[in-house]
Amino acid sequence: EVEKTACPSGKKAPEIDESLIFYKKWELEACVDAALLATQMDRVNAIPFTYEQLDVLKHKLDELYPQGYPESVIQHLGYLFLKMSPEDIRKWNVTSLETLKALLEVNKGHEMSPQVATLIDRFVKGRGQLDKDTLDTLTAFYPGYLCSLSPEELSSVPPSSIWAVRPQDLDTCDPRQLDVLYPKARLAFQNMNGSEYFVKIQSFLGGAPTEDLKALSQQNVSMDLATFMKLRTDAVLPLTVAEVQKLLGPHVEGLKAEERHRPVRDWILRQRQDDLDTLGLGLQG
């Protein structure tokens, strides 16, 4: 806490500029007007203030806005954002995607700090739902964001937002999450033609039911083994040998290498040996 002292004569800051880096902490406290600081926040980032000086500037803003900073100030916080605590951020009402991007940019290259986690939560709550633009922004900065949400939270994601999802955003999603995301993806991509549809839906197929896999087997999709191995075991088990052969196309030969792994292992055990023999791969049920 900085003591209240009168500003020395001639030291009153008429604007936020580089001359302030030579001010001692107590001089900054006494000579910089908080309202001026708030209106010229965008200049702070261009000035090489020390961490201690930034603490004083933050203190001034906290005194000016005890109920939380307005968005006009938040958007221009820049590196001062790194000084904020989760408690500070909980007082904010961030509604602009530009503000969110600006603050995530400041944190870029850093890890997901408690401050950033709080900021994202406040923003998403304020929006009411995870719309496409928000999801696009969050996954660009944190590709694992989507897979951190619970199935319950994912259920409120509108299908239109699924267009923002890239395959790498689903890398760490678990089967429960894919069970929620798959029907949304199916709805989002329903008007695409066969091959384009398969390219888009492929990453979500870990949540696909048997009937959808059967339908895909009729469309010459040539699913690769990596995708097949991520399918739900309970969805694969009812497929016939002929359906799996159609689903995989030329990749069907890869079943041999995966015969001891789920879901291939369990599927093989469900098939008649005569049917397996038609594949000519030497699979033993």
């Epitope: 944190y142 694992g144 939270e153």
Partner: nanobody
Framework: QLQLVESGGGLVQAGGSLRLSCTAS????????AKWFRRAPGKEREWVAS???????GYDDSVKGRFTISRDLAKNTVYLQMNSLRLEDTAVYYC?????WGQGTQVTVSS
């Protein structure tokens, strides 16, 4: 890049217990949840358990009722309490959070 370090693995008899830990480096928040996966010898990687952003949890059917996932935000750590261990639980256990992966910790269950 987020650094995750797993620990707590080891050799245990069938029916025994182990507690795995996954700690995130630096100022990283575990408030965005984490997951445990495992890879048994000669098998594909499989999901074990998740603790999600909102604190709810999920488990693969094979471990439900035996394993418990939890997190301590103050310690930036996620735990996997494994009880009633079976031979088929033998695997390298990996922790993942926000698309980052740890190096894994070996769990071996003997008869």
């Amino acid at each position: 890049q987020l650094q995750l370090v797993e620990s707590g693995g080891g050799l245990v008899q069938a029916g025994g217990s182990l507690r795995l830990s996954c700690t995130a480096s630096g100022s990283t928040s575990m408030s965005y949840g984490a997951k445990w996966f495992r890879r048994a010898p000669g098998k594909e990687r499989e999901w074990v358990a998740s603790v999600y952003r909102d604190g709810t949890t999920g488990y693969d059917d094979s471990v439900k009722g035996r394993f418990t996932i939890s997190r301590d935000l103050a310690k930036n750590t996620v735990y996997l309490q494994m009880n009633s261990l079976r031979l088929e639980d033998t695997a390298v256990y990996y922790c993942t959070a926000l698309n980052s992966w740890g190096q894994g910790t070996q769990v071996t269950v003997s008869s």
